[in-house]
């Protein structure tokens, strides 16, 4: 019996087609992805093959103005239109709190939403009961398939799930659910979830009875043969894990941003064992036409976005200096504003010992593309912020050793004075440079804001200590020559859309007046 699994993950609000790098579509003839194109391909496969499941492994939320404006209603609407069979909850589904998940998505989705390792307690337990499930058994052709969901247990550090949801260990939570399905004669089981490729592989290895793992969170690109675009494969598709009980378990993920549709064919024997598995992600390029009815719907929903872009988010009473002449040479108040917003967006009081789990921000000055003049009545709009942060990136959470941070700050000024983008703006960090010293030895003082303290203060950076830092995904991926970050990071979790982080902060503050305050000094 053959099953076709179509899968997406980490779509992050890319409802419209995008450029090849998943930013805003500029030249339509070279654009990719988007729900209208995805629907065309899905329907083509559904018509051609008998037993097809369309699954999403989480993080539909967060990433473009679509999410900022529609807050998840767009996800429910267009996933319903595409007739997804199931979705696992990702960490970003909690970005607007539990209410922001329940109302727009859980109550409106016409497909099961899954996670076996999220347990509700207190008053939330009855409110959320039945809105998401640990698993769902689906009839597919003449067989039944069990789909068991899971979500990163780091979600409380990455999003806003509140205090009434407990995120359990994935393997511990999945095993009893799979065991139960087995006793009920469900012998084909897919684990669908959002904990990253390493955990996906661990689930394949450790959870007895799981036949296939469809994952997300780590934006992992797997491919067999010559890859069709710029993404470099982390391994073959499917990636085969040998389980502890000796079975070959295919593990898949489909990069991110709706650029690819994962396509996996599994052959099962009559006892539900996987005999073979093969496939590849399908690049959703312009050779696949956009479905006209979905496209028309997208255009209808788009109207509200254009109106939103010009509405006032808040006011500034000072000039927001985002000029290259400032931000690539010295501390600039636009850099301070953005870093303050990045930290504010990551306030999670999850432990009494820590005032927050992260206190530091770094931001490449080259990523700041425009100032905002306060003389326009002080008005700040989404349009203004899109000029400052035009690349559609995210502000991510990483864990780095102090020694890596020291290298990053040396790199920040290794060729100072040439207006290059790697000069770092900061938050929760005090750095002193001596430019008379040779490159690689110019950081003379590097103090960082403590987190395990009741009164935050600046202490010298310790080389062997592990620190959490918020930074643009561009830096986490080694951009602007920050190869040491990419090579040495100990953990990387993708965060919220850059403009959304800053716009939310400005809306919250109402009036802003960031200053240059001595975060970066030269001796």
């Amino acid at each position: 019996w053959e099953l076709t699994i179509l899968h997406t993950n980490d779509v992050h609000s890319r409802l419209e087609q995008t450029s090849e790098d998943s930013s805003k579509c500029v030249n339509a003839s070279r654009c990719m992805g988007g729900v209208a194109r995805l629907f065309t391909k899905v329907q083509q496969i559904r018509r051609a093959e008998p037993n097809v499941l369309l699954l999403d492994a989480g993080d539909q939320y967060q990433g473009t103005i679509w999410f900022t404006v529609y807050k998840g209603a767009e996800v429910a609407h267009f996933m319903n239109a595409l007739r997804y069979d199931a979705m696992a909850l990702g960490n970003h589904e909690f970005d607007n709190g539990v209410e922001g998940l329940i109302e727009p998505l859980l109550k409106e989705a016409k497909f099961p939403i899954l996670s076996a390792n999220i347990k509700a307690k207190g008053p939330l337990a009855s409110q959320i009961s039945g809105l998401y499930l640990p698993y769902k058994v689906l009839p597919v052709g003449d067989e039944v398939v069990g789909i068991v969901g899971y979500t990163s247990k780091e979600t409380p550090f990455l999003s806003n799930p509140g205090t009434n949801l407990v995120f359990e260990d994935e393997i511990t939570a999945l095993q009893p659910e799979v065991d139960k399905l087995k006793t009920l004669n469900v012998n084909k089981i897919i684990a669908l979830g959002h904990s990253g490729f390493e955990m996906d592989k661990l689930i394949a290895q450790k959870v007895r009875g799981v036949d296939v793992v469809v994952g997300g969170h780590s934006n992992t690109f797997l491919y067999t043969g010559n890859p069709p675009s710029k993404e470099v494969p982390a391994g073959k598709y499917p990636f085969i894990v040998t389980s502890d009980d000796g079975r070959k378990v295919p593990v898949v993920q489909a990069y991110a941003f709706g650029k690819y549709l994962g396509y996996l064919k599994i052959e099962f024997d009559e006892r539900g064992n996987v005999i073979s598995s093969h496939g590849n992600p399908i690049l959703l390029n312009s050779s696949i036409p956009e479905d006209p009815s979905i496209k028309a719907d997208i255009n209808k929903w788009r109207i509200k976005l254009d109106n939103y872009s010009t509405q006032e988010l808040g006011k500034t009473i000072v000039y927001l200096d985002g000029s290259s002449q400032s931000c690539r040479f010295r501390e600039c108040n636009m850099g301070n504003l953005i870093c303050d917003a990045m930290i504010n967006n990551n306030l999670r009081h999850t432990d009494e010992m820590f005032w927050n789990h992260v206190s530091m921000c770094i931001l490449n000055g080259g990523g700041i593309r425009s100032p905002i003049d306060e003389r326009n009545n002080g008005t700040i709009t989404w349009e203004n912020l899109a000029a400052v942060l035009p690349f559609g990136g995210t502000f991510d959470l990483v864990q780095l050793k102090g020694s890596t941070l020291k290298k990053a700050f040396e790199h920040s000024v290794h060729r100072y004075g040439q207006s290059t983008g790697e000069f770092l703006q900061v938050g929760g960090i005090h750095v002193v440079y001596d430019l008379s010293r040779k490159p690689g030895d110019r950081v003379v003082k590097l103090d960082v804001l403590c987190t395990k303290c009741r009164v935050p203060s600046y202490d010298p950076l310790k080389m062997d200590e592990v620190y959490k830092v918020i930074l643009p995904n561009f830096l986490a991926n080694g951009g602007d020559g920050f190869q040491m970050i990419k090579d040495e990071l100990l953990r990387h979790d993708s965060g919220d859309q850059d403009i959304n982080v800053v716009s939310t902060y400005i809306s919250k503050m109402k009036v802003i007046y960031p200053a240059v305050e001595g975060r970066i000094k030269f001796s």
Epitope: S129, G130, L133, V137, P139, G141, K180
Partner: antibody, heavy 118, light 107 residues
């Protein structure tokens, strides 16, 4: 509005077969599975099976395997249930019911009474 | 197969009264539970699915609750047209299984 229309009562002889139609209207036929349910006189309900109108895929209650065949005709938006080798035990009212996105039955046909008697 | 035990099997109630019927599954059914109303000589009518979601057009006096193995249907203020037999159904796994029914009659 969503409707499932079933045929009138059937009086059949033991050993014979009967094929009950269920014509759907008011929605896209291929978007929802169809379940079938048996109700013997004065008894509770028994789930017989489920059919996917897209591909004709069926899931049967083990108890009815060999007794029942579910089929569909997409062109007329009609689901069929065939009962064979009929005995008095098969005397009952048979219902078709559409299932929603959650595979929960939402709209029911009016039922077809089958009486097996010589 | 999962067994569904409904209680009571029959009950009498007065108009305006609050009525609760319960259904217990032989194991956790993950809120995959529906409630139906059947009147004599008629086909069942679906009231609720996913334990607490009302089918369009069903009066708001009907509500469902519960999780795990235990579920209930409540009629907040009984009306004459609510008389009939009520059934629960688990659709968590195959085969789907119904409860034995609760006959609701006027006191």
């Amino acid at each position: 509005q969503v409707q499932m229309k079933q045929s009138g009562p059937e009086l059949v002889k033991p050993g014979a077969s009967v094929k009950i139609p269920c014509k759907a209207s008011g929605y896209t036929f291929t978007d929802s599975n169809m379940d079938w349910v048996k109700q013997s006189h004065g008894e509770s309900l028994e789930w017989i099976g489920d059919i996917n109108p897209n591909n004709g895929g069926t899931i049967y209650n083990q108890k009815f395997k060999g007794k029942v065949t579910l089929t569909i005709d997409k062109s007329s938006s009609t689901a069929y249930m065939e009962l064979r080798s009929l005995t008095s035990e098969d005397t009952a009212v048979y219902y078709c019911a559409r299932t929603n996105w959650d595979y929960a039955m939402d709209y029911w046909g009016q039922g077809t009474s089958v009486t097996v008697s010589s | 197969d999962i067994q569904m035990t409904q209680s009571p099997s029959s009950m009498y109630a007065s108009l305006g009264e609050r009525v609760t019927i319960t259904c217990k599954a032989s194991q956790d059914i993950n809120s995959q539970l529906s409630w139906f109303q059947q009147k004599p000589g008629k086909s069942p009518k679906t009231l609720i699915y996913r334990a607490n979601r009302l089918i369009d057009g069903v009066p708001s006096r009907f509500s469902g609750s519960g999780s795990g193995q235990d579920y209930s249907l409540t009629i907040s203020s009984l009306e004459y047209e609510d008389m009939g037999i009520y059934y629960c159904l688990q659709y968590d796994v195959f085969p789907r299984t119904f409860g034995g029914g609760t006959k609701l009659e006027l006191k």
